[in-house]
């Protein structure tokens, strides 16, 4: 990018540059029309018969440098060929010299600084590539010369450019003074400011465009070269902030439209709001959940919104004495989540009717909560109690919901307590065909033992047809019709008003081989 300090083609008034010395044959300003018929100013000099050592100087007005360290001067000029000048002597030249002088203000006068090299700094002696030929009575013909010179380094507030003629017949058609700067550039969402290079290459720190944030790593920078070009190099740039996406060739961040969101900074575009969420404003980093829908704390910001599950279905209970097996089906609505668990709440009611939360004597296997499978075994139920179990389904957002948690209830009433197992069986007498048994009366918690049931079968004969039962109201029994010398397995259970208790441990007994042995009392 070029920034113009002076362009005579654009000047609408007389230039009125200073000449020295005040003699005939000096530089003179002319006006004319350019290709577009715009009025332009030029300077001519043609003192080809000048006195030896006589120079004609032309100095521009003071030009503020505007921070430029190096300034470029593009000269357009024509130069008359000395051979085509009939009056030209040996002092005729086809070159001129360019100088500059720096100052902090417009302090030059008609006589100062002294019109010579040092204090003026020589830039170059300019020779014409194309010479103009002039024949008497005819128009001069020849190409315009264009030369660009480099001034500097400059350090003061401004400068003057000066032209020294020592015998040329020439016209300075235009002067363009400019400096080069790197234009403001936006790349990878990073804005690099317009920069005037002060050296061969200058590092320039970038800043993120509006609604962008720095990417991880070193802060973005680019190099501005002396020629006003940005050095090509990859830029670790910026990325659009949450709620914004890159637009217009990665030069700006655009707010996500309503109904879309972008949860993180970085690349990527705005996405439609996930299920059960919405964004009513532009620039959303997260979509708000619909009423009744939530995101768990651990859910990503871009996750769909979910809701607590409905209640489990079809709870089935199987009571086995003081143990209860509960089983159920998954809820119809999972709420859109995978992290489904179950929990149980329990209340117990005594036979008298008073109810309270279940006591600590109940055990739940695998546990009362955080169940991942749809079943549980409850142990330690008390007899003749009514239990109410509420089975609830939970997920990761259940804790965020307000209002009652839906549940599926099940009521279970335990039997009154049956007698304990009969285990201490004794054989009081045995013969080849019978066994006499006795046992201690068990302590029945709910009333007296009404009777007993004896279950026996020959060892090795396991089928149901080989099992025989005998009822007795006493705590003894005689088993008849047994095989000689055979082994029998015997179990006894007691019955009270609450029902039969469990069979006790199998007792191993053997009949006699022959009669001669007689009755023999045996101890188990």
């Amino acid at each position: 990018l070029e920034e113009t300090l002076l362009n005579t083609k654009l000047e609408t008034a007389d230039l009125k540059w200073v000449t020295f010395p005040q003699v005939d044959g000096q530089w003179e300003e002319l006006s004319g029309l350019d290709e577009e018929q715009h009025s332009v100013r030029t300077y001519e000099v043609c003192d080809v018969q000048r006195a030896p050592g006589q120079a004609h100087w032309l100095r521009t007005g003071w030009v503020p440098r505007r921070g430029a360290v190096h300034v470029y001067a593009t000269l357009r000029f024509t130069m008359l060929e000395c051979l085509s000048l009939p009056r030209a002597g040996r002092s005729c030249k086809e070159t001129f010299t360019v100088f500059y002088y720096e100052s902090d203000a417009d302090t030059a006068t008609a006589l100062t600084p002294a019109w010579m090299e040092n204090p003026y700094i020589k830039v170059d002696t300019v020779a014409a590539e194309h010479l103009t030929r002039k024949r008497p009575g005819a128009e001069a013909t020849g190409k315009v010369n264009v030369k660009t010179l480099r001034l500097g380094p400059l350090s003061k507030a401004g400068f003057y450019l000066a032209f020294q003629d020592q015998g040329a017949c020439m016209a300075l058609l235009s002067l363009h003074l400019f400096y080069k700067k790197c234009a403001q550039l936006t790349v990878n969402l990073t804005r690099f400011p317009e920069t005037v290079p002060r050296e061969l290459v200058v590092p320039v720190a970038g800043s993120c465009v509006v609604d962008a944030v720095p990417a991880p790593g070193p802060s973005p920078s680019l190099y501005c070269r002396e020629d006003g070009q940005w050095a090509e190099q990859p830029v670790t740039g910026c990325s659009c902030a949450p709620g914004f996406e890159a637009a217009e060739g990665n030069t700006k961040c655009r707010a996500c439209a309503q109904g879309t969101f972008k949860p993180l900074s970085g690349e990527g575009s705005c996405q439609p709001c996930p299920a059960n969420s919405h964004s009513n404003t532009i620039g959303s980093a997260v979509c708000q959940c619909r009423v009744g829908y939530f995101r768990a704390r651990t859910d990503p910001r871009g996750a769909p919104c979910t809701t607590p599950p409905s209640a489990p279905r079809s709870v089935v209970s199987r009571l086995n004495g003081s143990s209860l097996h509960l089983e159920w089906s998954a809820p119809l609505e999972s709420g859109g989540r995978e992290d489904l668990t179950y929990a149980l709440r329990c209340r117990e009611c005594r036979p008298g009717g008073s109810c309270a939360p279940c006591g600590g004597d109940l055990t739940f296997d695998p546990g009362p909560r955080d169940l991942v499978e749809p079943w549980v075994v409850v142990r330690g139920l008390r007899p003749d109690f009514t239990y109410t179990f509420e089975v609830t389904a939970l997920n990761g957002v259940s804790s965020l919901a307000t209002g009652p948690v839906p549940f599926e209830p099940v009521n279970v009433t335990t039997d009154r307590e049956v007698p304990p197992a009969v285990s201490d069986i004794r054989v009081t007498r045995s013969s080849p065909s019978s066994l006499s048994l006795a046992w201690a009366v068990p302590r029945a918690p709910s009333g007296a033992v009404l009777d007993y049931e004896v279950k026996y079968h020959e060892k090795g004969a396991e089928g149901p047809s080989s099992v025989r039962f005998l009822k007795t109201s006493e705590n003894r029994a005689e088993l008849r019709g047994l095989k000689r010398g055979a082994s029998y397995l015997v179990q006894v259970r007691a019955r009270s008003e609450a029902g039969y208790g469990p069979f006790g441990q199998e007792h191993h007994s053997q009949t006699q081989l022959d009669e001669s042995e007689g009755w023999r009392e045996q101890l188990a």
Partner: antibody, heavy 126, light 108 residues
């Protein structure tokens, strides 16, 4: 001899037309920018019109724009001013004048008049 | 467009210095030329580019221009210098020429 000689002046009725001529000699006419300047009786100088050396551009004072036309014939070394729709206030001595010349580039001229003709009187009266 | 203002008349004794002014907004930024016109004659250029003197014009004629005022100075005025003097400049379009109203110089 370097000179400019105007002719064509005279008495003309308002609304009438007149054509002034200016014959140039002693210099390279086709390299020169030329102008007409007038002076009403007892008044100051008033610039009327310019023409570039190749006739590529002409300029006029607001007071004559649309009524006067400047032209030149470089082969005849002559400058012209065609005056139409003349008014009483156009009564004046009309001078042709040469602008200061470039050394060798007829696209440019200096801003002063360095050569004048003796003038021709135009009287607009009924 | 710029307007150039001159005093209608200036009187000077022979041998004295006559100064004729020409004023206009920021006139110092423009080149000013001076013309001498004697009765019944065509104008003659006496000063151009503020202060340059054409060949054939006596050295007693000089010019300056700064600020809003250009000045024609005739040192050691002679009787033959009695004439009307006009300043002129190009307008901002650089193609239109403006003249001052003229100053009648009387040599007493």
């Amino acid at each position: 001899q370097v000179q400019l000689v105007e002719s064509g002046g005279g008495l003309v009725q308002p609304g009438g037309s007149l054509r002034l001529s200016c014959a140039a000699s002693g210099f390279t006419f086709n390299n020169s920018w030329m102008s007409w300047v007038r002076q009403a009786p007892g008044k100051g100088l008033e610039w009327v019109s310019n023409i570039t050396s190749s006739s590529s551009m002409t300029h006029y004072a607001d007071s004559v724009k649309g009524r006067f036309t400047i032209s030149r014939d470089n082969s005849k070394n002559t400058l012209y001013l065609q005056m139409n729709s003349l008014r009483a206030e156009d009564t004046a001595v009309y001078y042709c004048a040469r602008k200061g010349m470039s050394f060798y580039n007829n696209k440019y001229a200096k801003s002063m008049f360095d050569l004048w003709g003796q003038g021709t009187l135009v009287t607009v009266s009924s | 467009d710029i307007e150039l203002t001159q005093p209608p008349s200036v009187s000077v004794a022979p041998g004295q210095t006559a100064r004729i002014s020409c004023s206009g907004d920021n006139l110092g930024k423009k080149y000013v030329h001076w013309y001498q016109q004697k009765p019944g004659q065509a104008p003659v250029l006496v000063i151009y580019y503020d202060s340059k003197r054409p060949s054939g014009i006596p050295e007693r004629f000089s010019g300056s221009n700064s600020g809003n005022t250009a000045t024609l100075t005739i040192s050691g005025t002679q009787a033959e210098d009695e004439a009307d003097y006009y300043c002129s400049a190009w307008t901002t379009t650089m193609m239109h020429i403006v003249f001052g109203g003229g100053t009648k110089l009387t040599v007493l």
